[in-house]
Interface confidence: low
């Protein structure tokens, strides 16, 4: 369990991730939760991966914003949009690949402030 905080006093929010593992060739979930906001339009979710230039996924103003998405994740990601309003920023990753393993950052912006937390994602053939 990793809990991250923003860096600017009262303008920080708590973001929580859980290290997880994905089965190669199946779908995976990268878990991330945050202090909810009452307005969906004020929430921005960004998923980033260490060593990857583009974004893994971005969700803002109530919908996906994938113009900056890295090619390796194109068409393979989704947030659970109906649950963002209650603080769920988890990412669904389709067709997990060996190369998806690594350190991910869940970065959240709301009207309350900003926060982020890292997540270690392992991939392999798990039973």
């Amino acid at each position: 369990l990793i809990i991250g905080f923003g860096i600017s006093g009262r303008h920080s929010i708590t973001v929580t991730t859980v290290a997880s593992a994905g089965n190669i060739g199946e779908d995976g979930i990268l878990s991330c939760t945050f202090e909810p906001d009452i307005k969906l339009s004020d929430i921005v979710i960004q998923w980033l991966k260490e060593g990857v230039l583009g974004l893994v996924h971005e969700f803002k103003e109530g919908k996906d914003e994938l113009s900056e998405q890295d090619e390796m994740f194109r068409g393979r990601t989704a947030v659970f949009a109906d649950q963002v309003i209650v603080g769920n920023a988890s990412l669904r990753l389709k067709n997990v690949q060996l190369t998806d393993a690594g350190t991910y950052k869940c970065y959240i912006i709301t009207s309350k402030g900003k926060g982020n937390a890292n997540l270690e994602y392992k991939t392999g053939a798990f039973s």
Epitope: N23, E26, D27, G75, Q83, S90
Partner: antibody, heavy 120, light 107 residues
Framework: QLQLQESGPGLVKPSETLSLTCTVS??????????WGWIRQPPGKGLEWIGN???????YYNPSLRSRVTISVDTSKNQFSLKLSSVTAADTAVYYC????????????WGQGTLVTVSS | EIVMTQSPATLSVSPGERATLSCRAS??????LAWYQQKPGQAPRLLIY???TRATGIPARFSGSGSGTEFTLTISSLQSEDFAVYYC?????????FGGGTKVEIK
């Protein structure tokens, strides 16, 4: 073998909420390798994917229906359910539940389907 | 969303003949494509996934090919039980989408 069976009212009034349940038999809904989905087919037309749910409760909905759809799961009953609010005549369709593979995401097997008519 | 277009809308074929059905995606879906068969009053049945892999129990006369944006379902020798509507479905990107279907009817 795995079987899915839809159940629920066949007639719903406009502006009301359509509610259907899919009962899974011959296997556990808690299998980690599958999602559980809903697909609909208006009379004489093609198929439209509504959304799906993982046994943990994580959902993904078709953006075209997202504002009106809720899919939930009851692992103790081996069931998952669909609610579609504010229905109109355009929501009249055969509603199917199906198991969705966790990549490849093909649908197999399907329930036999249930016709829901929206009419006053 | 990715739009799937099937052609022709209706295909008239005699029993024993070959049927070739086409499915085109509005953008590349790699090999993330499935084919289904639907008979009147029945639920769809999975035939092919991964563009070319036959599902369990599907006869060898059904074959799928293609990748990217162009896909084909071939029924090598039509049997009476093959007359039905066929749908393609992409699972490359959310939301998953289906083609409009091709009805294979007896000539």
């Amino acid at each position: 073998q795995l079987q899915l069976q839809e159940s629920g009212p066949g007639l719903v009034k406009p502006s009301e909420t359509l509610s259907l349940t899919c009962t899974v038999s011959g296997g556990s809904i808690k299998s980690g390798s599958y999602y559980w989905g809903w697909i609909r087919q208006p009379p004489g037309k093609g198929l439209e994917w509504i959304g799906n749910i993982y046994y943990s409760g994580s959902t993904y909905y078709n953006p075209s229906l997202r504002s009106r759809v809720t899919i939930s799961v009851d692992t103790s009953k081996n069931q998952f359910s669909l609610k579609l609010s504010s229905v109109t005549a355009a929501d009249t369709a055969v509603y199917y539940c199906a198991r969705e593979g966790s990549y490849p995401n093909q649908f197999d097997p399907w329930g036999q389907g249930t016709l829901v008519t929206v009419s006053s | 969303e990715i739009v799937m277009t099937q052609s022709p809308a209706t295909l008239s074929v005699s029993p024993g003949e070959r049927a070739t059905l086409s499915c085109r995606a509005s953008q590349s879906v790699s090999s993330n494509l499935a084919w289904y068969q639907q008979k009147p009053g029945q639920a769809p049945r999975l035939l092919i996934y991964g563009a070319s892999t036959r599902a369990t129990g599907i006869p060898a006369r059904f074959s799928g090919s293609g990748s990217g944006t162009e896909f084909t379902l071939t029924i090598s020798s039509l049997q009476s039980e093959d007359f039905a509507v066929y749908y393609c479905q992409q699972y490359h990107s959310f939301p998953f989408t289906f083609g409009g279907g091709t009805k294979v009817e007896i000539k």
